[in-house]
Interface confidence: low
Amino acid sequence: EKPVYELQVQKSVTVQEGLCVLVPCSFSYPWRSWYSSPPLYVYWFRDGEIPYYAEVVATNNPDRRVKPETQGRFRLLGDVQKKNCSLSIGDARMEDTGSYFFRVERGRDVKYSYQQNKLNLEVTALIEKPDIHFLEPLESGRPTRLSCSLPGSCEAGPPLTFSWTGNALSPLDPETTRSSELTLTPRPEDHGTNLTCQMKRQGAQVTTERTVQLNVSYAPQTITIFRNGIALEILQNTSYLPVLEGQALRLLCDAPSNPPAHLSWFQGSPALNATPISNTGILELRRVRSAEKGGFTCRAQHPLGFLQIFLNLSVYSLPQLLGPSCSWEAEGLHCRCSFRAWPAPSLCWRLEEKPLEGNSSQGSFKVNSSSPGPWANSS
């Protein structure tokens, strides 16, 4: 039977600088079980090197010198006794680019270099970007673990160093930003800001980075009510708004949050399960009536909580004057005057430019005034 030396390995392999690659490989060689059983040694060499003198890139022979530049990075994986010659290459370097050949040695009879099946390794520039992974969604005020990892990287070669940058990291001790993981307690203002993880191999020039935009969930912190684009002043969760009766009113309620809160308007001070009069942040009243002086509430409902603000409407009426009208009665001349406005006005009689105060007597003059609102009556 003809001696059979066969090697199955791919012709070419491409790997990005700094990453790892596994090159599957199997081989066969002529062996008879009645032979003695010296150890089986296998070797990977750089092409063009002479097996007897050259340093190997990987071997299972403890007595052979391994090239310092491939030590720990090029490793035989798998069981050579089962004819597995798979080669693991870690922390690939540009200078690793080139051809490699496999050699088998066993006793005196088996010494063979598989020169016809060379492995061509090409190391290209690193374009792979790291992954930034959020183990849980970002929520304002809740510590969350982030990790930065590079697909295709492995622990061969010098360690990876990490650096994190971003506005959300400002209060952190710089040491905590040099690990592959980061515990972040985001704030509402961190939403939409950038976070960058940069990875670098110690002692190498290879760096790669990824930037993500933070998506921070946060409940509304404040509610603002706008009238004609102008924010109303708010004191202790209440806003005061003077408005003329009969006037059209359009109010906009805004409560910044992420995801956006559901905004609704209610009449008065509602119970939690009350029915809204508007299911948007906009409240439109075609004509304000004096009956609406009870006010309205804007509520911002969010998965992380709710906030509401009461709008106290002060409805003013334009003055309507009835009178004065005078008639002679038994006790003398009786003059009446009525005035409609809100709040109810105070009425004053003048006699030759001298004021007669309400509910008073002055000589032969007697004044009676009442203000049940919105009418003020005086006689």
């Epitope: 849980e136 990790s147 993981e181």
Partner: antibody, heavy 120, light 107 residues
């Protein structure tokens, strides 16, 4: 050699407490997140709890939340699991496992396991 | 919580057979999926992480594939030492969850 060695398992009555320890060696302990994973007799694997390398973040399965506490002492290269209010269903082999840096919470190194038996 | 469903729960195969185990997630786990091998009385051993990356020292006959919610572990030529239970695990979100396991037995 990278190694994890659990201890502290044993027999405990329902309602009782135990503290498991996991001693790590052969690697930079503080760089890796760690976890406890358990396996009830004849059953599959169940993740119990995880902790980040700096110990700033901790995570728990709903089944143990409020009863178990994970912690670590990076100066001693040791991971702990304090188990209170133990129940019969907590009976299992408890493994400590190391987080693979290339993928969060994939576990590349496991301890040999320690048996916790909760029985009256 | 993300549920991981493995199938089959057990299978019988011979040395040299090609074996395929599937794992389905109840929602996308992106590429945060790992496979483990466990032999009786022993701790689990990581085979594959990030769906298809072979862990250092694991024979190349093991391979992983899939994306999103459907994943596969393939043993191209079953060896005697491969008879064991295999578990998938997602690490996309907490709680981390494992599949129920697939026991590979000798036919």
């Amino acid at each position: 050699e990278v190694q994890l060695l659990e201890s502290g398992g044993g027999l405990v009555q329902p309602g009782g407490s135990l503290r498991l320890s996991c001693a790590a060696s052969g690697f930079t302990f503080s760089n890796h997140a760690m976890a406890w994973v358990r396996q009830a007799p004849g059953k599959g694997l169940e993740w119990v709890s995880g902790i980040s390398g700096s110990a700033a973040s901790t995570y728990y399965a709903d089944s143990v939340k409020g009863r178990f506490t994970i912690s670590r002492d990076n100066s001693k290269n040791t991971l702990y699991l304090q188990m209170n209010s133990l129940r019969a269903e907590d009976t299992a082999v408890y493994y400590c496992a190391r987080d693979l840096l290339a993928l969060p919470y994939a576990f590349d190194i496991w301890g040999q396991g320690t048996l916790v038996t909760v029985s009256s | 919580d993300i549920q991981m469903t493995q199938s089959p729960s057990s299978l019988s195969a011979s040395v040299g057979d090609r074996v395929t185990i599937t794992c389905r997630a109840s929602q996308s786990t992106s590429s945060y999926l790992s496979w483990y091998q466990q032999k009786p009385g022993k701790a689990p051993k990581l085979l594959i992480y990030a769906v298809s990356t072979l862990q250092s020292g694991v024979p190349s006959r093991f391979s992983g594939s899939g994306s999103g919610t459907d994943f596969t572990l393939t043993i191209s030529s079953l060896q005697p030492e491969d008879f064991a239970t295999y578990y998938c695990q997602q690490s996309y979100s907490v709680p981390l969850t494992f599949g129920g396991g697939t026991k590979v037995e000798i036919k």
